[in-house]
């Protein structure tokens, strides 16, 4: 039970006090007791429960005709059963006894009131009235945890507007209200109670810029909502009528968890005694609700796809046809960004990452806009954000970004268990340098901080700076699987490619050509590739880089070798000793459920079939996956990217609720 105030009683004059239902009020009977009295007894009205404990020994008994010694070891507490109909309608009488004097009486007139701030602390999607209880002041994780949840109101329900809903202090309509969390103030008091008392709703100054609270006028249109707390206003005096009354508030978060904001927001209602005009107002009681701002959550390839995004650029019609067909097979919506909007920037994966936020009453997809800000920079904010589709961005919006700040360098694993530690929403993966140096590249600290602060998908730093472009999607992917952990990790593997080519040479296919059918491209014989010592050295280096990541992923995701599939792939070291795919990088694939859009490798044709395609199909088809090889050679591959780089996917949110995990 929540702690109430301390009431001091005195025989000189009656004491008047307020007792809030659900709180435990301490009664000081000793400090004003007559000098020659040695004990006391208590009588109460039926609506008051008094408990007396004497320590030592800590015997506790309900009051009756018993008398109790007047000494510091006595603790008297009281609670009230119901709200008062009128001021001071409940009475407590303390009788002081002494050996030589008649009993001396002290009177306490109590007014019982119900003041309670409620929110969905049980995370059921409904607000249940709660009396003042300690639990509301703490937010706990896990299936048995409690505490309310706020969404950042980062969508744009008004198509006419260019701003997010949380950027204004108006409620657009009932749709906008659904993005907010309901909080109810319940009061039950005597009719005249608020002539002598005031309620103030407030938030800490350190949190005021992270939240906005609207007060709803009951039974009226949502447009009647008005801001009572927010970035410019940390407190608000409430006009509350006496009697039984409920007041609804709608709460929206304005900021995601981040470095200097753990995501917790406490809203408090304080009851002030304003009965003595000549004295300052005194706090009589406080009730608080703690909210946690819902984190931004990424979705892995194992989640069902719902929408595919791709750019239309000069001469990529065939690529578009292939992606369209794949999206249709996977029953996905397809969104094509036209040339006039993408400004010749085809790298849809690099511009944004689509995740979601979730509260018990609402789930919202949210696009995370990367700071790379090239031709597609307007696309997330102008075309993706909208009604029930949120937006967030981090990092410098002008300059100061590296290639590692593009979101081809941001992936997430499927759910994993590492030892005793569960990651039911998977772990974020991003690429970094091995160590900082004058020319090393890393993801901008603001992005790293944001990702870590979400707490629910603890990030893993991989090593990707060895690549020219430097993105993790150039050497890894995940595909769904029916067995084991429910997925496989795919890793690009020069070793596997050399093994395949060696086998083909041993079988007499050394003259088979790589890049057959590619105009203006030097076709390479298997035997020439195998005998090129420089290329071997380059791939030996690449293999070491990928193996470093392999061990890191095994350790951080709790994987065994049998959870990994090696995809044959060769690389070449280009300027500044950075690696690029030698032929289209098959691991850079689009995963739409069981349908995979894989860059067509243009490998050696043996017995009428590309041996690279055949090998990949033999590895993936047993998992129930369907491989479609997409020609991206001229439009993507020679521009240092592939199918995954050129596409993006909105996926179904996890059925697992983030608040049920323990980070």
């Amino acid at each position: 039970m929540a702690q109430g105030t301390l009431i001091r009683v005195t025989p000189e004059q009656p004491t008047h006090a307020v007792c809030v239902l659900g709180t435990l009020t301490q009664l000081d009977v000793c400090s004003s007791a007559p000098e020659d009295c040695t004990s006391f007894s208590v009588n109460t009205s039926p609506g008051v429960v008094v408990d007396i404990a004497h320590s030592p020994p800590a015997k506790k008994k309900s009051t009756g005709s018993s008398t109790w010694p007047l000494d510091p070891g006595v603790e008297v507490t009281l609670t009230m059963k119901a709200a008062s109909g009128s001021t001071g309608d409940q009475k407590v009488q303390i009788s002081y006894h002494g050996p030589k004097t008649p009993p001396v009486k002290a009177l306490l007139y109590l007014t019982g009131v119900e003041i309670s701030l409620s929110a969905d602390i049980t995370r059921t999607g409904k607000v249940k009235p709660t009396r003042a209880v300690e639990d509301k002041r703490t937010w706990t994780w896990g299936p048995c945890g409690q505490g309310a949840i706020l969404l950042v109101n980062c969508d744009r329900d008004n198509p006419e507007s260019s701003a997010m809903d949380c950027e204004d202090d108006e409620v657009l309509d009932s749709k906008d209200l659904k993005d907010m969390s309901l909080m109810t103030l319940s009061t039950k008091t005597p009719q005249d109670f608020f002539t002598r008392h005031t309620l103030v709703l407030h938030v800490a100054r350190s949190e005021m810029d992270k939240v906005r609270v609207f007060q709803a006028t009951r039974g009226r249109l949502s447009s009647r909502c008005r801001v009572v707390l927010g970035p410019k206003q940390p407190s608000h005096y409430l006009m509350v009528p006496g009697g039984k009354h409920n007041m609804d508030f709608y709460v929206e978060a304005l900021a995601f968890p981040d470095t200097n904001f753990p995501g917790l927001i406490t809203l408090t209602v304080s009851m002030l005694d304003t009965s003595k005009l000549e004295l300052p107002e005194a706090v009589v009681f406080q009730d608080s609700v703690v909210f946690r701002v819902a984190p931004w959550i990424m979705t892995p390839n194992t989640q069902p796809p719902q929408e595919v995004y791709v750019c239309s650029i000069f001469e990529n019609e065939d690529f578009l046809k292939s992606v369209t067909a794949l999206a249709m097979q996977a029953r996905c919506k397809l969104t094509i960004c036209p040339e006039e909007e993408n400004m010749d920037d085809q790298w849809m994966q690099d511009e944004m990452e689509i995740g979601y936020i979730q509260a018990p009453h609402k789930t919202l997809p949210v696009v995370f806009d990367s700071p790379r800000n090239r031709g597609l920079k307007e696309f997330p904010i102008k075309r993706v954000m909208g009604p029930d589709f949120g937006y967030v961005t981090r990092g410098p919006q002008t300059g100061g970004v590296s290639g590692l700040d593009s979101f081809g360098n941001l992936e997430v694993s499927p759910p994993v268990t590492v030892g005793d530690k569960e990651y039911p929403l998977g772990r974020i993966l991003f690429g970094d340098s091995c160590y900082p140096s004058s020319d090393s590249r890393e993801m901008h600290q603001a992005l790293q901080d944001f990702l870590s602060a979400q707490q629910v998908q603890a990030p893993v730093k991989l090593y990707s700076d060895w690549l020219t472009v430097g993105h993790v999607d150039e050497f890894l992917s995940f595909v769904p699987a029916p067995d084991r952990k429910g997925f496989r990790l795919l890793l690009a593997s020069p070793r596997s490619c050399y093994k395949l080519f060696q086998e083909q040479q041993n079988e007499g296919h050394g003259d088979a050509l790589l890049f057959q059918g590619i105009k203006k491209k030097n076709q390479q014989k298997i035997k020439n590739i195998l005998s090129n010592t420089t290329l071997r050295e380059h791939n030996s280096f690449v293999e070491r880089c990928i193996d470093w990541n392999r061990e890191l992923l095994k350790r951080e995701l709790g994987l065994a070798e049998s959870d990994i599939i090696d995809i044959p792939q060769l690389f070449k070291l280009k300027e500044f000793s950075k690696a690029e795919a030698f032929f289209p990088n098959m691991v850079n694939m689009l995963v739409l459920g069981k349908h995979l859009g894989i860059p067509k490798p243009f490998g050696p044709i043996i017995n009428g079939r590309c041996c690279l395609e055949e090998k990949v199909c033999s590895l993936l088809e047993p998992l129930g996956l369907h491989c479609t090889f997409i020609n991206d050679f001229y439009t993507y591959h020679i521009r240092h990217g592939e199918v995954h780089c050129g596409t993006n996917v909105r996926r179904k949110p996890f059925s697992f609720k983030w608040w049920n995990m323990v980070p």
Partner: antibody, heavy 128, light 111 residues
């Protein structure tokens, strides 16, 4: 063959900033590596910065790292050199140069390390 | 102080051959075959005449040839002509934190 024209040079005080532009014509810049090279009056050539215009991979000389930023706008077929915190020793003619990125090479051809097309240069003078 | 060392000047008569040396270290000229040579006439932009140690861009006369031995690269101009009078710079990829180094330049005078 691509042609390059530099602009944006001029007189600037120490600590000041300038942005040089290198506009390409005759070919699309996204197929090229572009470098900036400078030459102080009466002195030799000094390599300053590099960008792979296809994927914005960048590199800098020790003498300018942290002060200069190379970038590109493929839609405008232009590469930029943003020069901040300029010093007297940055006074030079700044040349923009390029090399075609030949994707056909089986292994690194080193095209990012040499410059087969040069602009005429633009003079930057840093003086109080 | 340039990272690659070239003689300040060389000279030769028309029709003769001259060789300009460019000495680096095991971390640049000695390690990589990414050595190039540039010709610069006064008031003009440099022009690439040799790349990847010995390769000539199209349009460059075969009188210009390049070679490398250990940490030293060389440019040889045979059958000297008056228009060859210019400054010549060598350049190499380097494993240092400045990845492209130039020599201090050599002034070629055709007597």
């Amino acid at each position: 063959q691509v042609q390059l024209v530099e602009s944006g040079g001029g007189l600037v005080k120490p600590g000041g900033s300038l942005r040089l532009s290198c506009a390409a014509s005759g070919s699309t810049l996204s197929d090229y590596f572009v470098s900036w090279i400078r030459q102080a009056p009466g002195k030799g050539l000094e390599w300053v910065s590099f960008i792979n215009t296809a994927n914005t991979f960048t590199y800098y000389a020790d003498s300018v790292r942290g002060r200069f930023t190379i970038s590109r706008d493929n839609a405008k077929n232009t590469v930029y050199l943003q020069m901040n915190s300029l010093r007297a020793e940055d006074t030079a003619v700044y040349y923009c140069s390029s090399a075609n990125d030949d994707v056909d090479d089986i292994v690194a051809p080193g095209r990012g390390y040499y410059m087969d097309v040069w602009g005429r240069g633009t003079l930057v003078t840093v003086s109080s | 102080q340039s990272a690659l060392t070239q003689p300040r000047s060389v000279s030769g008569s028309p029709g003769q051959s001259v060789t300009i040396s460019c000495t680096g270290t095991r971390g640049d000229v000695g390690r990589y075959n990414h050595v190039s040579w540039y010709q610069q006439h006064p008031g003009k932009a440099p022009k690439l005449i040799i790349y990847n140690v010995y390769e000539r861009p199209s349009g460059v006369p075969d009188r210009f040839s390049g070679s490398k031995s250990g940490n030293t690269a060389s440019l040889t101009i045979s059958g000297l002509q008056a228009e060859d009078e210019a400054d010549y710079y060598c350049s190499s990829h380097s494993r240092s934190s400045t990845p492209v180094l130039f020599g201090g330049g050599t002034k070629l005078t055709v007597l």
